[in-house]
């Protein structure tokens, strides 16, 4: 990985636009933490693994992972 | 319809400091990292500086570090790159340019927008 | 440091053939850290591709890119009077930069 010595954040630009769950092979939600001081969303995509940064304030963004998360209740026991 | 418009160019001493805009417009500045990208006269580009959407992460070429600083004010839509100790080396025309929509350390989605430059001559 | 080679320097075609730009890296690159620009003679430069081998927005399909490891490379199938220009690659690697090969050069036979 390019920057892992001297990253702070994961992002460098972020999207609005959902992605469709059923393209999704991952998501990821980064906390803030003393390394990087806002909350990263990571989708990676089943499509050649491409990996796109979410903005987590777009409503677009947060509707996909309520139905993300709610997918996740109905799978496990 | 998507637009970025550089400023700032013009003659300079060596020595002397310059500051380049970059007005963006046509999207939302604010969701996406910025570049400068310079293009030295009958020569290849050169990668300058880049600058994370929301200007927590700034990164520089090692030809530029220490003398060059990338900025930006999300509330002006606008993009910054103040230009010190200027050399007859930094001689170009300086082009902004837009970080591909969720690029991020693992993937890069290039640039995708560029504006059509301005032009920096360092000369005595 | 990560550099990069572009060959052939020029590249003289006519209209209707196809062509072959290659950029090669001194040591391997990640396919999702490669990109590909044209530029047009005062022109600012425009994204081909990104991740080696993703179309940007707008570009038609007879720009494609392949490639892996060491080795990339940009096909136009069949030339356009309008595809004549400067064609470079970009890898995105660590420190972080953001690294342009020299160029090539498609002009008209």
């Known amino acids: 990985v390019p920057l892992s010595r001297t990253v702070r954040c994961t992002c460098i630009s972020i999207s609005n636009q959902p992605v469709n769950p059923r393209s999704l092979e991952k998501l990821e939600i980064i906390p803030a933490s003393q390394f990087c001081p806002r909350v990263e969303i990571i989708a990676t995509m089943k499509k050649k693994g491409e990996k796109r940064c979410l903005n987590p304030e777009s409503k677009a963004i947060k509707n996909l992972l309520k139905a993300v998360s709610k997918e996740r209740s109905k799978r496990s026991p | 319809q998507v637009q970025l418009v550089e400023s700032g160019g013009g003659v300079v001493q060596p020595g002397r400091s310059l500051r380049l805009s970059c007005a963006a417009s046509g999207f939302t500045f604010s969701n996406y990292g910025m570049h400068w990208v310079r293009q030295a006269p009958g020569k290849g580009l050169e990668w300058v500086a880049v600058?994370?959407?929301?200007?927590?992460?700034?990164y520089y070429a090692d030809s530029v570090k220490g003398r060059f600083t990338i900025s930006r004010d999300n509330s002006k839509n606008t993009l910054y790159l103040q230009m010190n100790s200027l050399r007859a080396e930094d001689t170009a025309v300086y082009y902004c340019?837009?970080?591909?929509?969720?690029?991020?350390?693992?993937?890069?989605?290039?640039?995708?927008?560029w504006g059509q430059g301005t032009t920096v001559t360092v000369s005595s | 440091e990560i550099v990069l080679t572009q060959s052939p320097g020029t590249l003289s075609l006519s209209p209707g053939e196809r062509a072959t730009l290659s950029c090669r890296a001194s040591q391997s690159v990640s396919s999702s850290y490669l990109a590909w620009y044209q530029q047009k003679p005062g022109q600012a430069p425009r994204l081909l591709i990104y991740?080696?081998?993703s179309r940007a927005t707008g570009i038609p399909d007879r720009f494609s890119g392949s490639g892996s490891g060491t080795d990339f490379t940009l096909t136009i199938s069949r030339l356009e009077p309008e595809d004549f220009a400067v064609y470079y690659c970009q890898q995105y690697g660590s420190s972080p930069i953001f690294t342009f090969g020299p160029g090539t050069k498609v002009d008209i036979k």
């Open positions: 340019a837009r970080e591909g929509e969720g690029s991020n350390i693992y993937f890069f989605y290039g640039m995708d927008v």
């Open positions: 600058i994370d959407f929301a200007g927590i992460n700034k």
């Open positions: 991740g080696a081998s």
